[in-house]
Amino acid sequence: QVQVVTQDEREQLYTPASLKCSLQNAQEALIVTWQKKKAVSPENMVTFSENHGVVIQPAYKDKINITQLGLQNSTITFWNITLEDEGCYMCLFNTFGFGKISGTACLTVYVQPIVSLHYKFSEDHLNITCSATARPAPMVFWKVPRSGIENSTVTLSHPNGTTSVTSILHIKDPKNQVGKEVICQVLHLGTVTDFKQTVNKG
């Protein structure tokens, strides 16, 4: 059967993003419509046809355009994605003979981790704090020279869609840690980044 090939995309917040649909058919469509999937009913964004060219709905005027003007291959581009743009989008190819053939491409917005790593001595113990804020939620791990060191983790979701993960390493005998390196590892979207801290007695 005739089908539409799409690919999901993941792009960084406040950067451009493109979604593409390809009609696997001998014939071009008569008109292509892009819609955003919503809970109740899809919202029309933009259409392209030979008769009328590109017609962008007012709500999307300064947000998107069709950057591949095809009736078999169609690409929409968001100039500067925000968290509100995350979601799934439908491309509908209205074809002669076979009606509306649709595909769905989903856009995921990510925010690169912002990491802070610091330590604090207090009386007989040392606390090393590693905090990572990102979207989707990052994971925080520790690499320390010896085992048996306790840590506690707190997760906080922010209204802007990012999540902060804060992990505190509790070291009971801080003298043994002076001059040694502690590594906070942040895992985000499959990539692990090391953040190193050498403890100095202040």
Epitope: Q24, A26, Q27, L30, N51, F96, G97, F98
Partner: antibody
């Protein structure tokens, strides 16, 4: 040059089936939809269905309640329209045509199918 | 199914006349309408597609207009070879349906 050549006239008894062929030449067969329309004596044209030879996807007029089947043989550049459970009202001239999207340009010469007991 | 109604069903005209045939759809069909000419014993011939686009090789005296539910085929100056039956076809929604035809005769 582009040609659509249909099979010859047929006389069938009620309840029988008929299979009409439409042989295409002069162009790439899979690039155009093949459509079938018919015209009973003194009646308007009637769209029966069509096939996209590229995939073999077809679409039928539900009026024919599953009696019509459109197929294609890409190696022979030929489309077929089979109509089963024939009745006298199916007596008509059957035409195949080709279209690129909604642009119809070439037609077969027509095949007269007579259903009579 | 979408019903297509042509008017008039038949009309008599003379060579050189300007002739208008109308086609009305029972619901909005956008611009998805074609016009065909058919002569006795012959296959239909496409004249206009997408309401107003002329098929290659069709004389410019033929023109189409309209969108939504009301459509018109105009022949600006009738020629002897134009006497035939004319059909409209909607292809907005399946099954695609033809009008009943307009027979154009010599007066």
């Amino acid at each position: 040059q582009v040609q659509l050549v249909q099979s010859g006239a047929e006389v069938k008894k009620p309840g029988a089936s008929v299979k009409v062929s439409c042989k295409a030449s002069g162009y790439s067969f899979t690039d155009y939809i093949i459509l079938w329309v018919r015209q009973a004596p003194g009646q308007r044209l009637e769209w029966m269905g069509h096939i996209d030879p590229y995939y073999g996807s077809s679409n039928y007029n539900l009026k024919f309640k599953g009696r019509v089947t459109i197929t294609r043989d890409t190696s022979a550049s030929t489309a077929y329209m089979e109509l089963s459970s024939l009745r006298s009202e199916d007596t008509a001239v059957y035409y195949c045509g080709r279209s690129k999207r909604d642009y119809f340009d070439y037609w077969g010469q027509g095949t007269l199918v007579t259903v009579s007991s | 199914d979408i019903q297509m109604t042509q008017s008039p069903s038949s009309l008599s005209a003379s060579v050189g006349d300007r002739v208008t045939i109308t086609c009305k759809a029972s619901q909005d069909i956008n611009s998805y309408l074609s016009w065909f000419q058919q002569k006795p014993g012959k296959a239909p011939k496409s004249l206009i597609y997408r309401a107003n686009r002329l098929v290659d090789g069709v004389p410019s005296r033929f023109s189409g207009s309209g969108s939504g539910t009301d459509f018109t085929l105009t022949i600006s100056s009738l020629q002897p070879e134009d006497f035939a039956i004319y059909y409209c076809l909607q292809y907005d929604e399946f099954p695609y349906t033809f009008g009943q035809g307009t027979k154009l005769e010599i007066k």
